[in-house]
């Protein structure tokens, strides 16, 4: 066997994208590698070129169609192969039977906006992007708020165990700058994981009225 360790991990965004990461200890950075996707019940097949993302890690996106098109279903199986060029031939490095709806990672939520802000609370809404209609309401969210003097890692996680695309943050400090992020996860899928965090939304609470208790 090839020396060292390797890992091949892919996720489906529930619509028309399979994102893959392949890593192998000791592989050369300029190695030319691809991911090939062969569905068991579709007429198409797809290839993407793995591009380096770190010292021994490569990534690529299999674009299956228009961003909001439903290209795969719960019954689909896609055989994914990593192939790397060795001289004049391609060598198979890894193969995975991929069940798209068992390996979900949605796109980060988008369109975060402040609906209403007061001295001690703020109502924020967002939208999910490129999420399959198959989920109906079977989604959950995690949110976090960055307070002054803290890091994102220190921020407590707020869990929304239902498809609720808004949150009312309470017990905030008046006239204070905050940032807010949210991520989403379908309830379906053995290997399903959280989406990336959304772009942070910056907001500021209103100052306390002069001469009043705060």
């Amino acid at each position: 066997a090839v020396n060292g360790t390797s890992q091949f991990t892919c996720f489906y965004n529930s619509r028309a994208n399979i994102s893959c990461v392949w890593s192998q200890d000791g592989a050369l950075q300029d190695t030319s590698c691809q991911v090939h996707a062969w569905p068991d019940r579709r007429r198409w097949n797809q290839t993407c070129e793995l591009l380096p993302v770190s010292q021994a890690s490569w990534a690529c996106n299999l674009i299956l169609g228009a961003p909001d098109s439903q290209k795969l279903t719960t019954v689909d199986i896609v055989t994914l192969r990593v192939l790397c060029r060795e001289g004049v031939r391609w060598r198979v490095m890894a193969i995975q039977d991929f069940k798209p709806f068992e390996n979900l990672r949605l796109m980060a939520p988008i369109s975060l906006q402040v609906v209403h802000v007061e001295t001690h609370r703020c109502n924020i809404s967002w939208e999910i992007s490129q999420a399959s209609h198959y989920f109906e309401r079977h989604l959950e969210f995690e949110a976090r708020t960055l307070s002054p003097g803290h890091t994102w890692e220190e921020a407590p996680l707020l869990t929304l165990k239902q498809k609720q695309e808004w949150i009312c943050l309470e017990t905030l400090t008046p006239d204070t700058q905050y940032e807010f992020q949210v991520r989403v996860k379908p309830l379906q899928g053995e290997f399903t994981t959280w989406s990336p965090w959304s772009q942070p939304l910056a907001f500021r609470t209103k100052p306390a009225a002069l001469g009043k208790d705060t």
């Epitope: 066997a1 020396n3 060292g4 390797s6 091949f8 068991d40 199986i77 193969i95 069940k99």
Partner: nanobody, 121 residues
Framework: EVQLVESGGGLVQAGDSLRISCAAS????????MGWFRQAPGKETEFVAG????????HYADSVKGRFTISRDNAKNTMHLQMNNLKPEDTALYYC??????????????WGQGTQVTVAS
């Protein structure tokens, strides 16, 4: 508990055939690719063959292609390696392994204890 148990190894003559098997616990067998590796004395562990769990897609090392056939019996949670036209250089301890992927690196998640195959010239 995850268990992979190999069987069927033995001593054969060059040119003979042998079938080795691997029995796996049900959860592993139905959710993981299965494969065979081998290690000859003083040599590194070498990928031999692998088979995926849903489509039974197979992959072979160049050294055994056309001579060895990997298969799986889903009803019995068992994988087989049919080895034909055996050569002395096939002599090794053969290990059964399971992982989410077929990988040519020897870092699969689960391993058996091995079964010895010896090919005499």
């Amino acid at each position: 508990e995850v268990q992979l148990v190999e069987s069927g190894g033995g001593l054969v003559q060059a040119g003979d055939s042998l079938r080795i098997s691997c029995a796996a616990s049900g959860r592993i067998f139905s959710n993981y690719a299965m494969g065979w590796f081998r290690q000859a004395p003083g040599k590194e562990t070498e990928f031999v063959a692998g088979i995926t769990h849903l489509t039974s897609t197979t992959h072979y090392a160049d050294s055994v292609k056309g001579r060895f056939t990997i298969s799986r019996d889903n009803a019995k949670n068992t994988m087989h390696l049919q080895m034909n036209n055996l050569k002395p250089e096939d002599t090794a301890l053969y290990y059964c392994a399971a992982d989410r992927n077929i990988k040519i690196t020897a870092d699969w998640s689960y391993w058996g204890q091995g079964t010895q195959v010896t090919v005499a010239s």
